[in-house]
Amino acid sequence: QSSLTPLMVNGILGESVTLPLEFPAGEKVNFITWLFNETSLAFIVPHETKSPEIHVTNPKQGKRLNFTQSYSLQLSNLKMEDTGSYRAQISTKTSAKLSSYTLRILRQLRNIQVTNHSQLFQNMTCELHLTCSVEDADDNVSFRWEALGNTLSSQPNLTVSWDPRISSEQDYTCIAENAVSNLSFSVSAQKLCEDVKIQYTDTKM
């Protein structure tokens, strides 16, 4: 990948990722330097007859670093702080080729929950106020609420009225997703409204 347009690579928190390195065809490589955010990560000297010399120069990522046979960088047990700019410089007798990468770390979504703040009106109509959440949500998480295949909300929150006298049983499903995972959680309008009704009659007595 040329230095002008970095290759964007997605990694998943806790998993592994490979930054692929392409070699100049038919040229003998003298050495390869890998950099992270302009700081040296590793210095590799290939040998034709024996194993390459690999000098890991960044102790912070050192234990999680590995290199493939083609000197692509493998990073395991990914952490959020691995996010950033990576560069590989391949030096031959005649030239230096630069490859650039941008690594972003995405979280597998976990622990989807729905909280409910519903109320019952005098006419027995139940107004549902539902809020969906996932652990450590960031701006890359998309939320939506669906019922019978229709999207009712594109936000973590859903406000909807449900009348048990005219509506059949209805499930509302929150879907949370990002580029690497999705979770869903369904709630029953009938169940939620029954709970509210019990609270309502308890307070009336």
Epitope: L7, M8, V9, N10, T102, R104, D139, N140, S142, F143, R144, W145, T151, L152, S153, S154, Q155, P156, N157, L158, T159, V160, I175, E177, N178, A179, V180
Partner: antibody
């Protein structure tokens, strides 16, 4: 039917402020996020950010942090875009767009053209 | 941010012809949306989540793709299809649009 109607064209001087409105009808306003998109003359579309119409919390793309402000008037089902200290590069058509989920913009506003000229 | 590159920038086709335009992402994305825009008008939703046609979009349109490569195909171009088509990704903030493919009818 569902529609987003925006305020009319604006002619402003550099340094002035403009506030564009986007009135929604035909759906529950507070259930769908509202996005703002910029299109400079002869250019492509640029996402400016969005506002959560339930909580009122805005989120801005990096290029639109500072002079730009999203706001709501929930009782009027209306979203607003305000641009402060107008610059020549703000000259564009601005669209509001409803997010149907996964940032798919299923309904677009009529567009408001902002001209900046001294 | 994820950069979307659309090609070709301008596509010229005769009525009845099959055409394909592509959208390449600088990083893998899970879905792509497409919009149609005609001069002086607001963009219209055209294809969502890679392959689903928006309401009212003729069946001659289709969308496909995965990872970093997506495409919009028109099986038999008609005069009313003349417009600029934009792709848009949702996987990463900021949401980004491609530079557009302008379809001209001969």
């Amino acid at each position: 039917q569902i529609q987003l109607v925006q305020s009319g064209p604006e002619l402003k001087k550099p340094g002035e402020t403009v506030k564009i409105s986007c009135k929604a009808s035909g759906y529950t306003f507070t259930n769908y996020g509202m996005n703002w998109v910029k299109q400079a003359p002869g250019k492509d579309l640029k996402w400016m950010g969005w506002i959560n119409t339930y909580s009122g919390e805005p989120r801005y793309a990096d290029d639109f942090k500072g002079r730009f402000a999203f706001s709501l008037e929930k009782s009027a089902n209306t979203a607003y875009l305000q641009i402060n200290n107008l610059k020549n590069e703000d000259m564009a058509t601005y669209f509001c767009a409803r997010d149907y989920g996964r940032w798919y913009f299923d309904v677009w506003g009529t567009g408001t053209t902002v001209t900046v000229s001294s | 941010q994820i950069v979307l590159s659309q090609s070709p920038a301008i596509l010229s086709a005769s009525p009845g012809e099959k055409v394909t335009m592509t959208c390449r992402a600088s990083s893998s994305v899970s879905h792509m949306h497409w919009y149609q825009q005609k001069p002086g008008s607001s963009p219209k939703p055209w294809i969502y989540a890679t392959s689903n046609l928006a309401s009212g979009v003729p069946a001659r349109f289709s969308g496909s793709g995965s990872g970093t490569s997506y495409s919009l195909t028109i099986s038999r171009v008609e005069a009313e299809d003349a417009a600029t088509y934009y792709c848009q990704q949702w996987s990463s903030t900021p949401r980004t649009f491609g530079g557009g493919t302008k379809l001209e009818i001969k």
